[in-house]
Interface confidence: low
């Protein structure tokens, strides 16, 4: 998730006062809009155990950041799971990552001031073929 | 366990807290980390045996604009041979974010804030089989 | 195959105004970030503009920053840099290149143009 | 901004030769950098990226290793066509850098 340039064409009666990008500092409804899906992937789905390249979800539970738990994969093996409930060594399982979005507190501990902080989250595995280097 | 909510902490309120209107919190858009970069393995949405293509959301009324999603090529998996093998399946995998929505009313903006859910990318399971009694 | 083949560039005079312009064709496009890497004479390589796949993202060095602007045109499969205000440090061969990641930016460059001259001299 | 600096700048060496190069970086980068290799009058081309990981159809006798801010380029035989100027560019942050080259030229 990077910078967002954005510019919206803007009512014509309206007052000029309104910066046409979003301002650095905005007050925001403290209902947050799809608040209540549910945040833990074990109960959403077993895909990390159903997968050829499975994963473990660990904890990691932060107060002073909304969301304060996160859940994060790691990849169980190096290779991928075979028909026959086996490591195959020949695949590579390999975490899917992708960045967010959280609410960090800012100044810490402040009920209602917050700072939009980028993190990375290993988000499940996938089964890839390797990249192989034939030598010259 | 519910999600606590966003106003609530573990902590003392310190003295130095900005002053906040009623049911609104102050939020900085200026994003920490802003410029720190994740260093990607090459094409693995191409590699999987689940793989799957991307497209951009784009929306000028939300922050950031721009929303990357996922959708899987296959509903089964790629096998050995190239070849997509129907008894297994591709699944997305999802992941939440957080972004701030604009909204006009006739003059007036106001910011909400939003989960989005993103398809990340796609996995390779083994189906479940519900047998018939 | 993947080809960006650059052009616009040309002598102008300091304060001057210069568009380059980047075709590019064998690929998807608008799937890419696409970047301006400069190189003056004899010197080494500057990063100098970033556009994301829909050019809602862009990213400048200081030394550009409010002289050049990138764009973009997916439906003409082409890349632009507008360059103002143009000094003598601005000389240099100015190359367009392609992110090696689909749609997510991996921020290295698999695949460069031949390069097109600006010199800046009054 | 990020500096990166290579090292040397400049080296002789003949074919069949190892041929180590250095890039370090001003803080830490993680394994996010990238080695390109120049030739006179061409554009540059992706050799190496995160830090070790082979560009396709670049020859496996260069290798590149290291993490957080100690990098290194070698071409564990040189051949005539490696003979050129060498780049590290660091991925970690806005501005991207490059480092400001080693050229290898044939003793």
């Known amino acids: 998730i990077v910078k967002a340039g954005i510019t919206i064409p803007r009512n014509p009666g309206c007052p000029n006062s309104e910066d046409k990008n979003f301002p650095r500092t905005v007050m925001v409804n403290l209902n947050i809009h799809n608040r209540n899906t549910n945040t833990n992937p074990k109960r959403s789905s077993d895909y990390y155990n159903r997968s050829t390249s499975p994963w473990n979800l660990h904890r990691n539970e932060d107060p002073e950041r909304y969301p304060s738990v996160i859940w994060e994969a790691k990849c169980r093996h190096l290779g991928c799971i075979n028909a026959d409930g086996n490591v195959d060594y020949h695949m590579n399982s390999v975490p899917i990552q992708q960045e967010i979005l959280v609410l960090r507190r800012e100044p810490p501990h402040c009920p209602n001031s917050f700072r939009l902080e980028k993190i990375l989250v290993s988000v499940g595995c996938t089964c890839v073929t390797p990249i192989v280097h034939h030598v010259a | 366990r519910k999600i606590p909510k966003v106003g609530h902490t573990f902590f003392q309120k310190p003295e130095s807290c900005p002053p906040v209107p009623g049911g609104s919190m102050k939020l900085d858009i200026g994003i920490i980390n802003e410029n720190q970069r994740v260093s990607m393995s090459r094409n693995i949405e191409s590699r999987s045996t689940s793989p799957w293509n991307y497209t951009v959301t784009w929306d000028p009324n939300r922050y950031p604009s721009e929303v990357v999603q996922a959708q899987c090529r296959n509903l089964g998996c790629i096998n050995a041979q190239g070849k997509e093998d129907i008894s297994m399946n591709s699944v997305p995998i999802q992941q939440e974010t957080l972004v701030v929505r604009r909204k006009h009313q006739g003059c007036s903006v106001s910011f909400q804030l939003e989960k989005v859910l993103v398809t990340v990318g796609c996995t390779c399971v083994t189906p479940v089989i519900h047998h018939v009694q | 195959q993947v080809q960006l083949v650059e052009s616009g560039g040309g002598l102008v005079k300091p304060g001057g105004s210069l568009r380059l312009s980047c075709a590019a064709s064998g690929f998807t496009f608008s799937n890419y970030y696409m970047t301006w890497i400069r190189q003056a004479p004899g010197k080494g390589l500057e990063w100098i503009s970033y556009i994301s796949s829909t050019g809602g993202n862009i990213y400048y060095a200081d030394s550009v920053k409010g002289r050049f602007t990138i764009s973009r045109d997916n439906a003409q499969n082409s890349l632009y840099l507008q360059m103002n205000s143009l000094r003598a440090e601005d000389t240099a061969v100015y190359y367009c290149?392609?992110?090696?990641?689909?749609?997510?930016?991996?921020?290295?460059?698999?695949?460069w143009g031949q390069g097109t001259t600006v010199t800046v001299s009054s | 901004a990020i500096q990166l600096t290579q090292s040397p700048s400049s080296l002789s060496a003949s074919v069949g030769d190892r041929v180590t190069i250095t890039c370090r970086a001003s803080?830490?980068?993680?394994?996010?950098l990238a080695w390109y290799q120049q030739k006179p009058g061409k554009a540059p081309k992706l050799l190496i990226y995160d830090a070790s990981s082979l560009e396709s159809g670049v020859p496996s006798r260069l290798s590149g290793s290291g993490s957080g801010t100690d990098f290194t380029l070698t071409i564990s035989s040189l051949q005539p066509e490696d003979f050129a100027t060498y780049y590290c560019?660091?991925?970690?942050?806005?501005?991207?850098?490059f480092g400001g080259g080693t050229k290898v030229e044939i003793k």
């Open positions: 803080q830490g980068i993680s394994s996010a």
């Open positions: 290149a392609r992110d090696g990641g689909v749609i997510i930016s991996t921020a290295m460059f698999d695949y």
């Open positions: 560019q660091q991925f970690n942050s806005y501005p991207l850098t």
